[in-house]
């Protein structure tokens, strides 16, 4: 498929790359699996070549995508395999500790259970985890002490605390307490919830609906869940099996997802429903070996092999010996597209079908017998100086017209014989023997040696090459492993180590990463090469849609903290603020808290009272005591706001009651009486014959004996009674109860008399008051 056009017409972004405009130019934006200006190269970093936590970077080397490693601390080399000289190489961590490098000279040991200290050299008394039930073990001298959690006690925290025995009970609002090991459980009434039944039960708060379901209250204590597509159950806890009635074809296996399903296809098929045929010939350039031709078929492929090869992928050398006609007793050796018959003694010919005439020694002694490979007849090769069919005639070889030395050998005549000086590659008395360069077995790895003039040729077994077949053919040279698979060269074959996400002989099959249902929270999974993409439902994000989108970022709450929910948020307002976004400042002055005319100023979750002079306190509720200095001389001080008022005693006036009123000012004494001023009054000194207060009256009011139990004193225009003991009142007519003051002591009983009292004493006491 052609990618989108990018930059120049005709150029395309390959391998799923997207053409995007940036900074006024167009460029290919590649998926993670490919790199390069047109996304033409597999990403070399996908196979994670950098070891020991090294970081892989894609680099361009003469137009080809390659990688470079940035090594972590303590490592170097192209793949970060070589440790630099560092502290961890000195094996500082004892007793099975693991060394972590901090700098090249500093390290930290991670000690196994039972050991501690910088080098894991100290035995740990807490190693056996003696403190049960989450108790914290602290080494103490040569032993340990357990700090137990609240639910357990005892030296090793093994004794359960019965929380239900506490008073008052832990379960509120009529909840029933059940003690459990290490905890307790409250069974609440329908109206309450919470660990201790402390909260009124509000349906949907919190929501019991799982997998993103939406909760709706249906009553005071009931709810129902509206589930996301793909889920069911009272609380949406069940993933609906979407596989029944699936469309997976051609042997594809259905894998259930969330509100969807995926088809896991057999190697020959691909596509969403395994309906698309995999073109193995395009996918695997080396599907047919040894020059075979690949033909794609529906649901597979087949190979048309060249002469001499067979098998599904043309990897098997045809055994030509199976149909060979080597005669009985001959040994057949298979070659590529041919065979060779090794004859037994006495037989000859290509198929060992001829009797070897040399067996009967027809040639004269000293002659050499050769067999004609066509008819099996003997050919006598005579020694120097002899001729004839059986080499029985002596010859002067060199004087003959034909040179007796074969293969252009130089003839040197000798008595009764001759010698030949042979050219290179030949030997024997007549240079008739082609030197057999195969004698030294120069061909390695079971190859067949072909002797040639002055040289040899090795016919190699499959998988080997070179003059001596000494080179193991690099079957990896053609880079047969797809998707950045690592090719391992073997004898006449190769093996692909596939990167994560790919499988098959050539790493040609994309593993269906959606099969494990990696996408969470109702997300849809889209499979890709060595990857998958999750399409998230509303409110979720992250590679696996595992992250609840934080609607609290950016923080929408003006004056409060944000609590994230699924596709929503709640603002928990700071004291003094309200509103959906805590944007409204509550006016604390609206309740008019400032007393005594104080002015209120609103603040954050507070108010400030500015008090009038003479008042104080947060709410101006305290009226300062202006009477504290006792300003009223002869009167009672009444405190006011920022001041006081004096209520004067009779006879005094002025703002501080410090002026004695002159009652004589109005001349109250008549008939020549002299006035003497007093406090709140006056006294008239009357001339003789006048006696009432203002010297007006001449009458003696005592004449009528008004005082019943007392003596009468005449006064100006009136009288006064001086009462007898035990009596009181204006006219001494009220009998006083002298017993009121409990005068009788030591348990004596008091009896009130007309004048006085009488004590009746207890035994052993006497006297007027039993004292």
């Amino acid at each position: 498929a052609r990618g989108p056009r990018c930059s120049q017409p005709g150029e395309t972004c390959l391998n799923g790359g997207k053409c995007e405009a940036a900074n006024g130019t167009e460029a290919c934006v590649c998926g993670g699996a490919f790199v390069g200006p047109r996304c033409q190269d597999p990403n070399p970093c996908l196979s994670t070549p950098c070891k020991n936590a090294g970081t892989c970077h894609v680099v361009d080397r003469r137009g080809v995508a390659d990688y470079a490693c940035s090594c972590a601390l303590g490592f170097s080399g192209p793949l970060c395999l070589t440790p630099l000289d560092n502290a961890c190489l000195t094996n500082p961590c004892r007793n099975g500790g693991t060394c972590d490098l901090l700098t090249l000279t500093e390290y930290k040991c991670r000690c196994p259970p039972g050991w501690s200290g910088k080098s894991c050299q100290q035995a740990d008394p807490c190693a056996s985890n003696p403190c049960a039930n989450g108790g914290q073990c602290l080494p103490f001298e040569a032993s340990y002490i357990c700090h137990c959690p609240p639910s357990f006690h005892g030296p090793t925290c093994r004794q359960d605390v019965n929380e239900c025995g506490q008073k008052p009970g832990l379960c509120r609002h009529g909840g029933t307490c059940h003690n459990e090991v290490g905890s307790y459980r409250c069974v609440c009434r329908a109206t309450h919830t919470g660990p201790n039944c402390e909260r009124p039960y509000v349906p949907c708060s919190p929501s019991p609906c799982q997998n993103g379901g939406t909760c709706r209250p249906t009553g005071d204590v009931t709810h129902e869940c509206a589930c996301l597509p793909g889920f069911t159950g009272q609380n949406c806890e069940e993933n609906i099996d979407d596989c029944p009635g699936n469309n997976c074809k051609n042997g594809g296996a259905c894998v259930d997802g969330v509100n969807t399903y995926n088809c896991r296809c057999p190697p020959e098929w691909t596509g969403q429903y395994c309906t698309e045929d995999v073109d193995e010939c395009q996918l695997m350039p080396n599907a047919c070996q040894n020059g075979g031709t690949c033909h794609n078929t529906h649901g597979g492929y087949n190979c048309v092999c060249v002469n001499g090869w067979t098998g599904e992928d043309c990897s098997e050398n045809i055994d030509d010996c199976a149909s060979a006609a080597c005669f009985h007793g001959a040994t057949c050796h298979d070659r590529v597209a041919s065979f060779y018959c090794e004859c037994p003694h006495g037989r000859t010919g290509l198929l060992c079908h001829l009797n070897d005439a040399c067996i009967s020694n027809p040639c004269n002694e000293g002659s050499n017998c050769d067999t004609n490979p066509v008819n099996g007849k003997a050919i006598c090769t005579c020694p120097s100086g002899y001729t004839g069919p059986a080499c029985s005639q002596d010859v002067d070889e060199c004087s003959l017209g034909a040179n007796p030395c074969e293969h252009a050998g130089k003839c040197i005549n000798t008595l009764g014989s001759f010698e030949c000086q042979c050219l290179q590659g030949y030997t024997g008395p007549r240079c008739e023997i082609d030197v057999n360069e195969c004698v030294s077995n120069p061909c390695q790895n079971d190859a067949t040696c072909l002797d040639q003039i002055g040289e040899f040729q090795c016919i190699c077994m499959p998988g080997y090459e070179g003059v001596h077949c000494e080179v193991n053919t690099d079957e990896c040279a053609s880079s047969p492993c797809l998707h950045n698979g690592r090719c391992l060269d073997k004898i006449n074959e190769f093996q692909c180590e596939c990167p994560t996400g790919f499988t098959g002989h050539l790493c040609q099959y994309d593993v269906d990463e959606c099969a494990s249902t990696p996408c969470k929270n109702g997300a849809k999974c889209l499979d890709g090469p060595n990857t998958y993409t999750c399409v998230c439902t509303e409110g979720y994000t992250g590679t696996h849609c595992e992250v609840d989108i934080d609607e609290c970022d950016p923080d929408p709450c003006h004056y409060g903290s944000c609590k994230d929910g699924v596709a929503t948020f709640t603002c928990l307002c700071r004291p003094g603020y309200t509103g959906h976004h805590c944007e409204t400042n509550i006016n604390e002055c609206s309740s008019q808290p400032c007393r005594h005319g104080g002015t209120c100023q609103d603040r954050d979750n507070a108010y400030l009272c500015f008090c009038l002079k003479g008042t104080t306190g947060p709410n101006c509720e305290i009226n300062l005591d202006d009477c504290a200095s006792s300003p009223c001389d002869s009167g009672t001080c009444l405190d006011k706001i920022d001041g006081y008022e004096c209520a004067c005693e009779p006879g005094y006036t002025g703002s501080m009651c410090n002026i004695n009123i002159d009652e004589c000012a109005g001349n109250p004494c008549h008939n020549g009486g002299t006035c003497e001023d007093g406090i709140n009054g006056f006294t008239c000194r009357c001339p003789e014959g006048y006696h009432d207060p203002t010297c007006l009256s001449e009458v003696n009011e005592c004449n009528s004996n008004p005082c019943v139990h007392g003596a009468c004193r005449d006064s100006l225009n009136g009288y006064k009674c001086d009462c007898d003991p035990g009596w009181s009142g204006t006219n001494c007519d009220i009998n006083n109860n002298e017993c009121e003051s409990n005068p009788c002591v030591n348990g004596g009983t008091c009896k009130d008399m007309t004048s006085g009292y009488v004590c009746t004493c207890r035994e052993g006491f006497s006297g007027p008051n039993c004292q």
């Epitope: 395999l81 440790p83 000289d85 190489l89 000195t90 094996n91 004892r94 090249l104 000279t105």
Partner: antibody
């Protein structure tokens, strides 16, 4: 280039203490440990311990625990080794070495003879 | 038994290969051990040659000729220093070293004589 210059030869009586110094140059003193290795006449090498000039942390061979002191003075780029309670078998050439785990650069050695 | 054992001497002809062994005590894991090799000529301090842990974790010190290489023989629980094409200047003592239990341990040394 890296150099480790050691103090001169010493002749000591049994029971006394010897102190050898090792002045370094050509690299950052705190980037490597200073190891001490000795070699008795005609014998093999014996590692004694190292000091980390960064924090004066030391590590000893168990054999020398208690009578070996190693220090590093970063202001003078100098390491020192002190061996107490000397005995005749402490007669050896004492080397200071720069390295971490690989004992890469060696001083020329200081000959210490213990004899009554 | 010594932690590291080296044969006391070894002879080699010029141009031949010499293989020096450093046998680890049986309780020490060869696979996880990193073996360091040093050369010492008479009257001189030792010289660091190389360290060998595996083919991917080996390190020839700068200036050391490439004829020196490290390897391991798992069947003998031994580290090996190979000098391929021995030269007369290679006549020296050779010491192996490992880090064991937080400390450094040397072998007894092997004297190499070039014939």
């Amino acid at each position: 280039q890296v150099q480790l210059v050691q103090s001169g030869a010493e002749v000591k009586k049994p029971g006394t203490t010897v102190k050898i110094s090792c002045k370094v140059s050509g690299y950052k003193f705190t980037d490597y440990y200073i190891h001490w290795v000795r070699q008795a006449p005609g014998k093999g090498l014996e590692w004694m311990g190292f000091v980390d000039p960064t924090d004066d942390e030391t590590r000893f061979a168990e054999k020398f625990q208690g009578r070996l002191t190693m220090t590093a003075d970063t202001s003078r780029d100098t390491a020192s080794m002190e061996l107490s309670s000397l005995r005749s078998e402490d007669t050896a050439v004492y080397y200071c070495i720069r390295g971490i785990a690989a004992l890469a650069d060696w001083g020329r050695g200081t000959m210490v003879t213990v004899s009554s | 038994q010594a932690v590291l054992t080296q044969p006391s001497s070894l002879s080699a002809s010029p141009g031949a290969s010499a293989s020096l062994t450093c046998t680890l005590r049986s309780d020490i894991n060869l696979e996880t051990s990193r073996i360091y090799w040093f050369q010492q000529k008479p009257g001189s301090p030792p010289r660091y040659l190389l360290r060998y842990q595996s083919d991917s974790d080996n390190n020839l010190d700068s200036g050391v000729p490439s004829r020196f290489s490290g390897s391991k023989d798992a069947s003998a629980n031994a580290g090996i220093l190979l000098i391929s094409g021995v030269q007369s200047e290679d006549e020296a003592d050779y010491h192996c070293m490992i880090w064991h239990s937080g400390g450094s341990v040397f072998g007894g040394g092997t004297k190499v004589t070039v014939l």
